[in-house]
Interface confidence: low
Amino acid sequence: QDVRVQVLPEVRGQLGGTVELPCHLLPPVPGLYISLVTWQRPDAPANHQNVAAFHPKMGPSFPSPKPGSERLSFVSAKQSTGQDTEAELQDATLALHGLTVEDEGNYTCEFATFPKGSVRGMTWLRVIAKPKNQAEAQKVTFSQDPTTVALCISKEGRPPARISWLSSLDWEAKETQVSGTLAGTVTVTSRFTLVPSGRADGVTVTCKVEHESFEEPALIPVTLSVRYPPEVSISGYDDNWYLGRTDATLSCDVRSNPEPTGYDWSTTSGTFPTSAVAQGSQLVIHAVDSLFNTTFVCTVTNAVGMGRAEQVIFVRETPNTAGAGATGG
């Protein structure tokens, strides 16, 4: 009956962690004697190829300084402890502790048997590192030039993480990769870049980080912060201002970051009706007269700059009873 070595084609281990390289001789065959078990690295320099051996009586030995006896152990193999106990070498699973990048490569598990001869199996050990992810907004001021408004950083991954962004904005990503502080790892930084405008302020974008160590992609929401001058509109004019009307109000509606620091009401004609009283963002009209046949201007200032809106007023002789709809500035 033929025997075979059961190994995994590939094993993944976490950088700095412990990994087991399974190796079993199957099936159990009565009378088959295992004289020696060895682990080798066929791709390593000659003096480092023999990694570990297990002798039925002498037990384990680890000839190579890399990885070395302090980082290697056999999980289940047992040596003979006396005449009445047999060595158990069918399971030659090897544990490798404190994984380093240099540990990555091919490992061959070999059983020297009698009478069947040597049989072997090969496993590829991959060393991976789970990256640590963070994302943050960059406080920026509006401009005409593309600017980084958010950063997403995946630190010290192996292999490098894949970063993408989920957003409905018009953006592009710029990625850089640098070596991590842990040897063999990579820190990936993705810069979410756009022309910063008020439209982007307060918008949440999502950084998506994919890595083979994750069960599912990491999704990190980031709320953008763009400082921009006031965007102004005027509401309250309903196209039915008539002489003597007393309940009219104009409102200066503003979107800005940061908040407005001042409102200024004026007219394009330079004449400001005395019955119009500015109260911050509102212009309260006590009584409409012919001086209101003008264009009102609301100018709003914040720490970034200023914005303005105009509203043309047409004063009627009498109320319009046709039911006009409200119109904005």
Epitope: T204, T206, E215, E216, L219, P221
Partner: antibody, heavy 116, light 107 residues
Framework: QVQLVQSGAEVKKPGSSVKVSCKAS????????IHWVRQPPGKGLEWIGA????????NYNQKFQGRVTITADESTSTAYMELSSLRSEDTAVYYC?????????WGQGTTVTVSS | DIQMTQSPSTLSASVGDRVTITCRAS??????VAWYQQKPGQPPKTLIY???YRYSGVPDRFSGSGSGTDFTLTISSLQAEDVAVYYC?????????FGQGTKLEIK
Amino acid sequence: QVQLVQSGAEVKKPGSSVKVSCKASGYIFTSYWIHWVRQPPGKGLEWIGAVYPGNSDSNYNQKFQGRVTITADESTSTAYMELSSLRSEDTAVYYCTKLVGTFDYWGQGTTVTVSS
Amino acid sequence: DIQMTQSPSTLSASVGDRVTITCRASQNVGINVAWYQQKPGQPPKTLIYSASYRYSGVPDRFSGSGSGTDFTLTISSLQAEDVAVYYCQQYNTNPFTFGQGTKLEIK
């Protein structure tokens, strides 16, 4: 941080309906399923159903089909669970919970008592 | 519906003991099993997801294992603060179902 804040305790008559709300904050409301789980006094947990606020898709435990309606209001980041034709065995603490990989965030629970 | 059968229903152990709770699914659920801890007056908290993955912030004395139909939650060294009810839950098939719970007490 993620928070799920549920509405207050309710006492209802048999045959009536109850609507429990769950206001979410601290994450993208439309990106995660919100589930509802109940727990009768001194008993185990029972999954009722779920809603995906991104498209208002809902999914119910057959046991409650026809009696339960789970909805979400994207504008207020609030999920609702309405249970009708109440009976005494519906007395329980009702939880809303956010599904990521598992139920990783929970509301504080809403006690619903059905009594004549 | 998939039945999740937990055992034991009640468990009494001493501080420092290794504690094991098992959960059997009535049909194959892969590794789509979570474990929760619930203390009186509180909602449940996730301990383990995907059968063996420890949730963020969960002490490493908690571990999970299993796949298919048989699953285990292990507390390697019981602490006084671990007194609670523990639930398994499958999320492989709709409807999601929970085990009936295991009440863990300190001797």
